[in-house]
């Protein structure tokens, strides 16, 4: 029943060109190249893409033509290796070109940079953007794909095509509007925020596949799809999981043409079989391809079937538990996960995976015992503390969020995480803690039944950002341990970290706390980041500072910024009042 078993094609590049069409083919090749060579100028990538496209067309015309039988990795890798400045721009990545496939592609993958040294994208004036859009729509949209792809080397390529389609629609509509800015800017903000979220979610999928293997990803997919499609049979869910795993393995492996093609096939299969999958798919399946795939990926959970039997009957009370487990361990555990997940849309996927792991560990131990049934009879009792831990954590943190509001809640998390892992770079701590803090506005508004899946699965995505950024430059054994030991226990691992008593406080540097008049012209968000950066640095200097001490200093700092931004001579104010603030803060913190 696998959707993707196709006959072998003489020319893979011709096959994908025909399946995807020229427009999508070119866009996906551009994304692939930009995700590999993140520093290359736009024009160089466009040139490479055009060359590949012309070559693909010759293969469509004659599949037996020279080189048309080569694999896509060979063709694309050969093309990337023609870049003249490879050694100067990328250093040791150039050594990849000395390797043969598949090692060459693996080498390129290993050099993808989650935090490339690229300038922040600055949004031009609306009129400038509209002019550029009208002057050359194709180049304008290609540039969007290029800029996103190079900054997000694991962005889910077929989904980026969907974002580009929305980006184009926003400009098409708003550049004709009476108030272009009022129309366009909210749309661009929404695309930016959704894009960052989409990138982070996909990064977790790739990390799951690459660091923990296919089995880990499949377990995640079984749990999530069982929650989403609780009426579907286990065999149907298993089939969707197999196909989805193939799609994401391809995208995470840089096989973007295959990935996009297979994702389209999967969407087609789901829509053709929606009666046996979910009652919620009807609207999605009426949409065009890109919207359809996106809609299916985001579709709400179907209603649970009535009269679902007790789980204990088959998985605890049955005398056949060990026999069933021994006969096909992963299938039996998959059925357990499916049955548990479809009954618990109120649980996070990571919690469901922890329960499945506990169940597996119990069976491993008990099925070798003298009386297996007696041994595993109380396994469901072991689930109680595992369920209560995230429930309590979410309750406490939502109460704190409601009390403080987002900004101050982020600050509380900044302090908490800086004390846990003070070795991590300040920009990373600020970025991660800010994102962790967004869980409040994102999830605390939900009723109890939706809070945990919202919060804990979101936290998994954010903590993965910390893990991938830390992996590039590891500085903390504690971060490494929490990131690598267990994918599903990352959040509990970080939650359990106490203040790092081994940390030697950072030397005080007045320059870190010197501010200038430019802070006054920053957006509210940028100003918050400046203040939060200062807060992290304060904690790094004085990890034992109390909440009260830090609050006093931060309040003084906010008052100082407000005062100087109102002053006639802002720069003088910042210089003079800044010195006083630093001195007062040192005194308050005993530095």
């Amino acid at each position: 029943r696998g959707v993707f078993r196709r006959d072998a094609h003489k020319s893979e590049v011709a096959h994908r060109f025909k399946d995807l069409g020229e427009e999508n083919f070119k866009a996906l090749v551009l994304i692939a190249f930009a995700q590999y060579l993140q520093q290359c100028p736009f024009e160089d990538h466009v040139k490479l893409v055009n060359e590949v496209t012309e070559f693909a067309k010759t293969c469509v015309a004659d599949e037996s033509a020279e080189n048309c039988d080569k694999s896509l990795h060979t063709l694309f890798g050969d093309k990337l290796c023609t870049v003249a400045t490879l050694r100067e721009t990328y250093g040791e990545m150039a050594d990849c070109c000395a390797k043969q496939e598949p090692e060459r592609n693996e080498c390129f993958l290993q050099h993808k940079d989650d935090n490339p040294n690229l300038p922040r994208l600055v949004r031009p004036e609306v009129d400038v953007m509209c002019t550029a859009f009208h002057d050359n729509e194709e180049t304008f949209l290609k540039k969007y794909l290029y800029e996103i792809a190079r900054r997000h080397p694991y962005f889910y390529a077929p989904e980026l095509l969907f974002f580009a389609k929305r980006y184009k629609a926003a400009f098409t509509e708003c550049c004709q509007a009476a108030d272009k800015a009022a129309c366009l800017l909210p749309k661009l903000d929404e695309l930016r925020d959704e894009g960052k979220a989409s990138s982070a979610k996909q990064r977790l999928k790739c990390a799951s596949l690459q660091k923990f293997g296919e089995r880990a990803f499949k377990a995640w997919a079984v749990a999530r799809l069982s929650q989403r499609f609780p009426k579907a049979e286990f065999a149907e869910v298993s089939k969707l999981v197999t196909d989805l795993t193939k799609v994401h393995t391809e995208c995470c492996h840089g096989d973007l043409l295959e990935c996009a093609d297979d994702r389209a096939d999967l969407a087609k299969y789901i829509c053709e079989n929606q009666d046996s999958i979910s009652s919620k798919l009807k609207e999605c399946c009426e949409k065009p391809l890109l919207e359809k795939s996106h809609c299916i990926a985001e579709v709400e959970n179907d209603e649970m079937p009535a009269d679902l039997p007790s789980l204990a009957a088959d998985f605890v009370e049955s005398k056949d538990v060990c026999k069933n487990y021994a006969e096909a361990k992963d299938v039996f555990l998959g059925m357990f996960l499916y049955e548990y997940a479809r009954r618990h849309p109120d649980y996070s996927v990571v919690l469901l995976l922890r329960l499945a792991k506990t169940y597996e560990t119990t069976l491993e131990k008990c099925c070798a015992a003298a009386d297996p049934h007696e041994c595993y009879a109380k396994v469901f009792d072991e689930f109680k503390p595992l369920v209560e831990e995230p429930q309590n954590l979410i309750k406490q943190n939502c109460e704190l969020f409601e009390q403080l509001g987002e900004y101050k809640f982020q600050n509380a998390l900044l302090v908490r995480y800086t004390k846990k892992v003070p070795q991590v770079s300040t920009p990373t701590l600020v970025e991660v803690s800010r994102n962790l803090g967004k869980v409040g506005s994102k999830c605390c508004k939900h009723p109890e039944a939706k809070r945990m899946p919202c919060a804990e699965d979101y936290l998994s995505v954010v903590l993965n950002q910390l893990c991938v950024l830390h992996e590039k430059t590891p500085v903390s054994d504690r971060v490494t341990k929490c990131c690598t030991e267990s994918l599903v226990n990352r959040r509990p691992c970080f939650s359990a970290l106490e203040v790092d008593e081994t940390y030697v406080p950072k030397e005080f540097n007045a320059e870190t706390f010197t501010f200038h008049a430019d802070i006054c012209t920053l957006s509210e968000k940028e100003r918050q980041i400046k203040k939060q950066t200062a807060l992290v640095e304060l904690v790094k200097h004085k990890p034992k500072a109390t909440k009260e001490q830090l609050k006093a200093v931060m309040d003084d700092f906010a008052a100082f910024v407000e005062k100087c931004c109102k002053a006639d001579d802002k720069e003088t104010c910042f210089a003079e009042e800044g010195k006083k603030l630093v001195a007062a803060s040192q005194a308050a913190l005993g530095l």
């Epitope: 679902l308 009957a313 088959d314 998985f315 009370e317 005398k319 059925m335």
Partner: antibody, heavy 121, light 110 residues
Framework: EVQLVESGGGLVQPGGSLRLSCAAS????????MGWVRQAPGKGLEYIGI???????YYASWAKGRFTISRDNSKNTVYLQMNSLRAEDTATYFC???????????????WGQGTLVTVSS | IQMTQSPSSLSASVGDRVTITCQSS????????LSWYQQKPGQPPKLLIY???DLASGVPSRFSGSGSGTDFTLTISSLQPEDFATYYC???????????FGGGTKLTVL
């Protein structure tokens, strides 16, 4: 009224197939394992197999491969698919409700009236 | 797995005490997963005893079961006219695939 009603029996040629149904009324099938038992004319009871509440199936060694038990909880019905039928499969086929949910205890406390299957050319 | 019932047939009178035995070729699950059934012509079987000695709902107290492991007994303390029928034992074993019925004991009027 709590009852089980089998249907789908009849005359079938050797090598043929038949699907028997067992419809439950007055209770939900999803709370118990459901078994199939047969009885050749003038002979004793013979266990065929059982399907647990979660859909796990267990078959007598002789039935494995030829007979398949399935259930549709939404229709409150259990099925017995029989393939490659032989003359010796001629019997009254009963469906029965086990005391257990996840396995066969051998204690079937509710039985249907049975449906006769005759395999003959 | 074999379930052997004895005797295969038995004649008795109303008021008699009757004992039927059932032996399995290996121990039943938990040493007590043994049931007894009564079947009358043209009817489905009726559960009398489960877990070796527990009386099924609505079954008269003259029926009782005993035994453990591989050897089990069904006793009817005082035969009534409606008790003349065929009796079967059924054993549950460590796998649900191995559930098995005995060959039956036909109880007739002497």
């Amino acid at each position: 009224e709590v009852q089980l009603v089998e249907s789908g029996g009849g005359l079938v040629q050797p090598g043929g197939s038949l699907r028997l149904s067992c419809a439950a009324s007055g209770f939900s099938l999803s709370s118990n394992a459901m078994g199939w038992v047969r009885q050749a004319p003038g002979k004793g009871l013979e266990y065929i197999g059982i399907i647990s509440v979660g859909g796990f199936t267990y078959y007598a060694s002789w039935a494995k491969g030829r007979f398949t038990i399935s259930r549709d909880n939404s229709k409150n019905t259990v099925y017995l698919q029989m393939n490659s039928l032989r003359a010796e499969d001629t019997a009254t086929y009963f469906c029965a409700r086990d005391r257990h949910g996840g396995d066969s205890s051998g204690a079937f406390y509710l039985w249907g009236q049975g449906t006769l299957v005759t395999v003959s050319s | 797995i074999q379930m052997t019932q004895s005797p295969s047939s038995l004649s008795a009178s109303v008021g008699d005490r009757v004992t039927i035995t059932c032996q399995s070729s290996e121990s039943v699950y938990s040493n007590n997963q043994l049931s007894w059934y009564q079947q009358k012509p043209g009817q489905p079987p009726k559960l009398l005893i489960y877990d070796a000695s527990d009386l099924a709902s609505g079954v008269p107290s003259r029926f009782s079961g005993s035994g453990s492991g591989t050897d089990f007994t069904l006793t009817i303390s005082s035969l009534q006219p409606e008790d003349f029928a065929t009796y079967y034992c059924a054993g549950g074993f460590s796998s649900s695939s191995d559930t098995a019925f005995g060959g039956g004991t036909k109880l007739t009027v002497l």
